[in-house]
């Protein structure tokens, strides 16, 4: 059976009723977050390997909405929810408090001021 | 403005009203083609860098619907249409008459009998 997906912003990717867009321009984490917010979206949140299995195919590194809380060492999403165990393998690439998404559900720690491409997501 | 995408088979990726699915199981080109056909789709056809810019992000190698015609050296899609120039860089990885899609609009020549993952596509 066929079905429609969305609704999503024009020309975004729709998968399992979530909307994704990959942005080519390099921005720091804060600018990336602002860019997503301006489009009524947020930086990528990884919440399910099953519902987001398209992410295993993504090449390169892109900012996602995951940040490190230095005071307690936890990893949280922009919305304040805590990273679920077994979802991402967090790799210490640089000293930093932000994370880049890389293929096969890996997260690379990076300085939040470093420019990178980014992924915005909108949950429908 | 937001809009719906599709219609697509359940759990396929929808982008600019085309439907895509990435299959993990390795099959030869002919089996991959049959698998797509059984789902009322075809192997990936690359026809536009603009309309299919999500493909630049794809990691790894996957069968697409491009075949080499040994008698005249042309590259054609399953539907008989000719590969447009400037769309794909065709790289001679192996001697063969089928092509794997790889990120950034590259096509790798491979023996059609070699098992690989594959991308199905359905144009809406």
């Amino acid at each position: 059976t066929e079905s429609y997906c969305g609704p999503c912003p024009k020309n975004w990717i729709c998968y399992k009723n979530n909307c994704y867009q990959f942005f080519d321009e390099s921005k720091n984490w804060y600018e990336s977050q602002a860019s997503c917010m301006s489009q009524n979206a947020s930086l990528l949140k990884v919440y399910s390997k099953e519902d987001q299995d398209l992410l295993k195919l993504v090449k390169s590194y892109h900012w996602m909405g995951l940040v490190h809380i230095p005071t307690n060492g936890s990893w949280q999403w922009e919305d304040g929810s805590i990273l679920s165990p077994n979802l991402l393998t967090i790799i210490e690439m640089q000293k930093g408090d932000c994370a880049l998404y890389a293929s096969s559900f890996k997260g690379y720690i990076e300085n939040c001021s470093t420019p990178n491409t980014y992924i915005c997501m909108q949950r429908t | 403005t937001e809009s719906y995408c599709g219609p697509c088979p359940k759990n396929w990726i929808c982008y600019k009203n085309n439907c895509y699915q990435f299959f993990d199981e390795s099959k030869n080109w002919y089996e991959s083609q049959a698998s797509c056909m059984s789902q009322n789709a075809s192997l990936l056809k690359v026809y536009s860098k603009e309309d299919q810019d999500l493909l630049k992000l794809v990691k790894s190698y996957h069968w697409m619907g491009l075949v080499h015609i040994p008698t005249n050296g042309s590259w054609q899609w399953e539907d008989g249409s000719i590969l447009s120039p400037n769309l794909l860089t065709i790289i001679e990885m192996q001697k063969g008459d089928c092509a794997l899609y790889a990120s950034s609009f590259k096509g790798y020549i491979e023996n059609c009998s070699t098992p690989n993952t594959y991308i199905c596509m359905q144009r809406t």
Epitope: - | P70, G73, S74, L83, P85, I91, E92, I109
Partner: antibody, heavy 122, light 107 residues
Framework: EVQLVESGGGLVKPGGSLRLSCAAS????????MNWVRQAPGKGLEWVSS????????YYADSVKGRFTISRDNAKNSLYLQMNSLRAEDTAVYYC???????????????WGQGTLVTVSS | DIQMTQSPSSVSASVGDRVTITCRAS??????LAWYQQKPGKAPKLLIY???SLQSGVPSRFSGSGSGTDFTLTISSLQPEDFATYYC?????????FGGGTKVEIK
């Protein structure tokens, strides 16, 4: 700078043989298909033969099939054309040309060498 | 084999003129067409590829158009250095074939 330099042309009798060479520089030779194109005196251009980057695909014009052999040595950045059973109608300037764009779906020729003249006459 | 028919075989024009050369393929070749310029005693030079893409370093007065079977090379304002012979070539299949050439001469 991309450069192609042909050599090996000359005067040969009908039925004779000649081997043309093309030395390439300024680009990654092993990534490109290569070609021979000829031009008879006062005439137009005629494609002769093409060889893919790894020599997997080789094509010849009907007029030279069975008599000419194209080959390449990627380690030496060199392209060759072995010409046997030469005929008067093979008299032409022979150009070596790189296939463009990069890869196996190379539809056109850029750049071209300066050419080498092959004269077949008794 | 795909035949390429070029017309006219020669054209006389003056500096500043607009010159149009046409090329017809005997079967559809999508956009797999190139145009070359050749001056006497010199090797051909690629001007246009993929029917309409201008090769790097080629002046913008040269343009190409067409798809399928009918193609055009246009020189918008002929310059003294443009007097030469022009060839079209299909690149979709082997054997690669050229048009017969168009000689652009000074009027």
């Amino acid at each position: 700078e991309v450069q192609l330099v042909e050599s090996g042309g000359g005067l040969v009798k009908p039925g004779g043989s000649l081997r043309l060479s093309c030395a390439a520089s300024g680009f990654t030779f092993s990534s490109y298909s290569m070609n021979w194109v000829r031009q008879a005196p006062g005439k137009g251009l005629e494609w002769v033969s093409s060889i893919s980057s790894s020599s997997s695909y080789i094509y010849y014009a009907d007029s030279v099939k069975g008599r000419f052999t194209i080959s390449r040595d990627n380690a030496k950045n060199s392209l060759y054309l072995q010409m046997n059973s030469l005929r008067a109608e093979d008299t032409a300037v022979y150009y070596c040309a790189r296939g463009a764009p990069v890869g196996a779906a190379a539809g056109w020729f850029d750049p071209w060498g300066q050419g080498t003249l092959v004269t077949v006459s008794s | 084999d795909i035949q390429m028919t070029q017309s006219p075989s020669s054209v006389s024009a003056s500096v500043g003129d607009r010159v149009t050369i046409t090329c017809r393929a005997s079967q559809g070749i999508s956009s797999w067409l190139a145009w070359y310029q050749q001056k006497p005693g010199k090797a051909p030079k690629l001007l246009i590829y993929a029917a309409s893409s201008l090769q790097s370093g080629v002046p913008s007065r040269f343009s190409g158009s067409g798809s399928g079977t009918d193609f055009t090379l246009t020189i918008s304002s002929l310059q003294p250095e443009d007097f030469a012979t022009y060839y079209c070539q299909q690149g979709v299949s082997f054997p690669r074939t050229f048009g017969g050439g168009t000689k652009v001469e000074i009027k």
